[in-house]
Interface confidence: medium
């Protein structure tokens, strides 16, 4: 069995994490965005989850069964987490305080098993995502053995209810990622986080990383029966980490623009399969050069911007006379966009310069998502009579 984390600097405390969820109704098309008619309101209570107490948990009270009484009472799922670890529980717990939202969707989970086995229990999958690119967790929850003798029965779920009117489940498998969206510079190395935890008695069968981009799907890395195979050159997954730390994170060295896209980490156990989706964005910083096309009466300035990705770039021109302050200049024209073999973009901006009587300094400034602050190049344009 997996051990619970040991107390570290702070004290570990077991708390109930209550989440507002939607339950996808049976028959609703799974995998698509469910409409409001296909979904019912639900609550998920993760029971006694160990979280690190930084002193902010004093006012937390455990979930009381009758506290959610409303005109349209939601279905309440109580999920014990004794069999697995939920390492990102703090993020779920503190989402409200940090101005983030948690989206939660619960749906029936169907095992590829015989009818007789399925009739003895029911399974649900809960997908939770913290907004702003935070953690994402998928849980497989199992209800106790179903017997018709139960006093309380849920009419639509066709499941027994606890005396408090909740659906009791136990989490048997979870797959999570700490970051749903990542941005890395072209040429750098990326680590895509994917971790899992499973109940004792379950065996790890396979790990599969896939990339989907612009309608294309391709296998990146697969691990099965103790053997790892990288389809994308250099992709690595640490087999020792799989067994020890339940860490299926993928490392991609030497990123190219072809590596950009949606990565799916799929973990298959002897009973369950779950996945996480991670968006990898590649960025390349532009380089800027400013040159003079000719030295006629009205010289033309050419600002070459190259090697940037993604496509969106903002180019501004400013003019500053000696002793004056910079003023933005309009009237620039752009060359056609070029794309290099590596996939980065290049463009040129042209501007007719007016040096004035004393000369002026022109600056071409480039703003791009990959830059912390705009990048600029400047040159001085002197009037014709001062050119020697």
């Amino acid at each position: 069995a997996e051990t619970k984390p040991h107390p570290a600097e702070g004290q570990w405390r077991a708390v109930d994490v209550v989440l507002d969820c939607f339950l996808a109704k049976d028959g609703a098309h799974r995998g698509a965005l469910a409409s409001s008619e296909d979904r019912a309101r639900a609550s998920l209570v993760l029971k006694q989850v160990p979280v690190l107490d930084d002193g902010s948990l004093e006012d937390f009270t455990d979930f009381q069964g009758g506290t959610l009484a409303q005109d349209d009472p939601p279905i309440i799922f109580e999920a014990s987490v004794d069999l697995v670890q939920i390492p990102q529980a703090e993020a779920l717990l503190h989402a409200d305080c940090s101005g983030k939202e948690v989206t939660c969707e619960i749906s029936r989970y169907f095992l590829q098993m015989t009818e007789t086995t399925v009739k003895t229990a029911a399974w649900f999958m809960a997908n939770m995502q913290v907004s702003g690119g935070g953690p994402s967790i998928s849980l497989v929850m199992k209800t106790p053995r179903v017997t018709k003798n139960e006093a309380l029965w849920h009419p639509t779920l066709n499941l027994p209810l606890s005396p408090q009117g909740t659906v009791r489940t136990a989490v048997e498998f979870q797959v999570m990622t700490q970051t749903q969206s990542l941005s890395f510079l072209l040429g750098s190395s990326a680590s895509l986080d994917c971790g899992f935890s499973m109940a004792p008695g379950l065996d790890l069968i396979s790990v599969e990383w896939r990339l989907q981009h612009k309608g294309r799907g391709q296998l990146v890395y697969s691990w099965t029966a103790g053997q790892g195979q990288a389809v994308r050159k250099g992709a690595t997954l640490e087999p020792a980490q799989l067994g020890m730390a339940r860490d299926a994170s993928l490392t991609l060295p030497g990123l190219t623009i072809q590596d950009e896209g949606t990565y799916i980490c799929q973990i298959t156990t002897s009973l369950y399969r779950a996945q996480q989706i991670i968006q990898l964005n590649i960025q390349a910083s532009p380089k800027v050069r400013l040159s003079l096309a000719n030295e006629a009466l009205l010289p033309t300035l050419i600002c070459d911007i190259a090697g940037y990705y993604p496509l969106d770039v903002v180019v501004t021109w400013t003019r500053e006379e000696l002793g004056g302050s910079p003023a933005q200049v309009s009237g620039a024209s752009f060359s056609s966009l070029r794309q290099s073999v590596a996939g980065t973009y290049s463009i040129s901006s042209s501007l007719t310069a007016e040096p004035g009587s004393a000369g002026a300094t022109y600056t071409c400034q480039v703003t791009h998502i990959s830059l912390e602050e705009p990048l600029g190049a400047s040159t001085q344009v002197v009037p014709p009579e001062r050119r020697t």
């Epitope: 380089k287 050069r289 400013l290 040159s291 003079l292 096309a293 050419i302 070459d304 190259a306 090697g307 060359s335 070029r338 290099s340 290049s346 040129s348 990048l375 190049a377 400047s378 040159t379």
Partner: antibody, heavy 117, light 106 residues
């Protein structure tokens, strides 16, 4: 693989024009990149002289004033340096260089030009 | 023009010794680039964009810095590192080189 080769007279008389050619193989001059002339004086000081870009725009070192001109012939895949009114101070090893935005990634082997009567 | 001052002008190091040379710019630059030149050959791009190693450059070399101050470091000197190293700025015109640091071996 991009390769550059300088050629031209090794001896130029003062007040005359220094003319050098850089022949580029493995890449088309007009496909991209910037094509530079750089010189190294006898004391090893390096000086950037100017460039011509893939689109034909030029940029010169102001210290060379109106003495310098860089042009290219795309049909021959060559670019040229003309430096007029030379003096003994222009004695140097002249390099042509190409860059793909990572500054002078490609260099010629250099050619020594002596300015002397 | 942006004057690049390199120090020291000449230095010597024993094999295995850590070597650091600096380049100071009179005006702030976005990036600094470094070239290695061995006698009677053309300079080679060695470090670009401040810290990226050019193709074929050993991992014992590193570059760092920002604004007006940059440096090139060799973690463990080897005989093949004997050369002159020039810093170069491409952020403003005219493009300028440093005067060079000549690295010798003890």
């Amino acid at each position: 693989d991009v390769q550059l080769q300088e050629s031209g007279p090794g001896l130029v008389k003062p007040s005359q024009t220094l003319s050098l050619t850089c022949s580029v193989t493995g890449y088309s001059l007009t496909s991209g990149y910037f094509w530079h002339w750089i010189r190294q004086f006898p004391g090893n000081k390096l000086e950037w002289m100017g460039y011509i870009s893939y689109s034909g725009t030029t940029n010169y070192n102001p210290s060379l004033k109106n003495r310098i001109s860089i042009t290219h012939d795309s049909s021959k895949n060559q670019f040229f340096l003309n430096l007029n009114s030379v003096t003994a101070e222009d004695t140097a090893t002249y390099f042509c260089a190409g860059d793909d935005w990572d500054w002078f990634a490609y260099w010629g082997q250099g050619t020594l030009v002596t300015v002397s009567a | 023009e942006n004057v690049l001052t390199q120090s020291p002008a000449i230095m010597s190091a024993s094999p295995g010794e850590k070597v650091t040379m600096t380049c100071s710019a009179s005006s702030s630059v976005n990036y600094m680039h470094w070239y290695q030149q061995k006698s009677s050959t053309s300079p080679k791009l060695w470090i670009y964009d401040t810290s990226k190693l050019a193709s074929g450059v050993p991992g014992r070399f590193s570059g760092s810095g920002s604004g007006n101050s940059y440096s090139l470091t060799i973690s463990s000197m080897e005989a093949e590192d004997v050369a002159t190293y020039y810093c170069f700025q491409g952020s403003g015109y005219p493009l300028t080189f440093g005067s060079g640091t000549k690295l010798e071996i003890k």
